[in-house]
């Protein structure tokens, strides 16, 4: 049975040209993490975070996007077409599969309306 | 063109140890990790761990964690995986291959280590 | 750990046939699988990735398609140099392969 739940940092908008965390958290489940994938708006993988082979990050994204803060991904030079879902799957044993949603606005303004806990400045 | 060009056969006693090398060329060594997996006979392909060049950091499975040690000479483009306490379990072809984000795009020919008394 | 089983495990064509191998998952592989074709005392080559993207170099007559839990590879004209064992892998929940199928000559 899957006890667990998944929280993300929702609907979340950063400033073109700056950088964001992606973050989602698993709780209320003992379930052990074996994988954690994130994957973009066009359900396209961007990385992966296997619990024994570490950080595995798709070629073309190498050089915008960094693993970590923990389980997170951290988009840096942010384009307007980095505006959409992005998706975490928890892969977990013995639970199964737990799915995170956020919704990232990319603003072409100076001012970014985002919680300051999930923002690089 | 991209080429892993792995070390000969080796035939070891049980309880050796066995260091096969994986040369690597035709690419920038540092920009992808190396992996080492093995296929024993009639048994299915298994991944044992990983180097990343850049840092020399590695990851292992479990399964591999306590026997198996990776290392790169990056200044000659290698990567080396030595397997130790060997068994006969451990007779198998042994693999270097690139990844290339999330699968391998290149293999070495694969080295064979037969474990035997 | 997502395991793999392909079908069948043997498989006897003639040259010109049309061959197609399954590879089936405990788990949805969301897409996420590869094909690799092996000859003997050789390196496993890349033939497909993501499910249907053909590898660069690799011949059209090789294509991939499936979605959820089953797989398939298909040969649509089989070559003399098509003869190997081809294995399926996917990374969607570990990194695992298929324990292969060997085409031989019938």
């Known amino acids: 049975m899957m006890t667990g739940t998944i929280e993300t940092t929702g609907n979340i908008s950063a400033k073109k040209g700056g950088s964001v965390i992606l973050q989602c958290h698993l709780s209320s489940t003992m379930a052990q993490v074996t994988q954690v994938n994130w994957e973009q708006h066009d359900h396209s993988l961007l990385a992966i975070r296997n619990a024994e082979l570490g950080w595995h990050i798709y070629p073309a994204f190498k050089d915008r996007v960094a693993p970590g803060p923990g389980l997170g991904l951290t988009l840096q030079s942010l384009t307007m077409n980095d505006t959409g879902e992005y998706f975490c799957t928890y892969h977990t044993y013995p639970d199964g599969t737990y799915r995170g949603r956020i919704f990232l606005e990319v603003l072409e303004s100076s001012v970014a309306e985002h919680s300051a806990r999930f923002q690089i400045p | 063109e991209v080429q892993l060009v792995q070390s000969g056969a080796e035939v070891k006693k049980p309880g050796a140890s066995v260091k096969v090398s994986c040369k690597a060329s035709?690419?920038?060594?540092?920009?992808?990790?190396i992996y080492w997996l093995r296929q024993a006979p009639g048994q299915r392909l298994e991944i044992m761990g990983r180097?990343?060049?850049?840092?020399?950091?590695?990851y292992f499975v479990d399964k591999f964690k306590n026997r198996a040690t990776i290392t790169t000479d990056t200044s000659a483009s290698t990567a080396y995986m030595e397997l130790s306490s060997l068994r006969s379990e451990d007779t198998a072809v042994y693999y270097c291959?690139?990844?290339?984000?999330?699968?391998?795009?290149?293999w070495g020919q694969g080295t064979l280590v037969t474990v035997s008394s | 750990d997502i395991q793999l089983t392909q079908s069948p495990s043997f498989l006897s064509a003639s040259v010109g046939d049309r061959v197609t191998i399954t590879c089936k998952g405990s788990?949805?592989?969301?897409?996420?699988l590869v094909w690799y074709q092996q000859k003997p005392g050789k390196a496993p080559k890349l033939l497909i990735y993501?499910?249907?993207n053909l590898q660069s170099g690799v011949p059209s007559r090789f294509s991939g398609s499936g979605s959820g839990t089953e797989y398939t590879l298909t040969i649509s004209s089989l070559q003399p140099e098509d003869f190997a064992t081809y294995y399926c892998?996917?990374?969607?929940?570990?990194?695992?392969f298929g324990q292969g199928t060997k085409v031989e000559i019938k």
């Open positions: 291959a690139r990844i290339d984000g999330f699968y391998f795009d290149f």
């Open positions: 035709g690419y920038t060594f540092t920009e992808h990790s």
């Open positions: 180097i990343d060049p850049k840092n020399g950091r590695t």
């Open positions: 788990q949805n592989v969301n897409k996420y």
């Open positions: 993501s499910t249907d």
């Open positions: 892998y996917q990374y969607n929940n570990g990194f695992t």
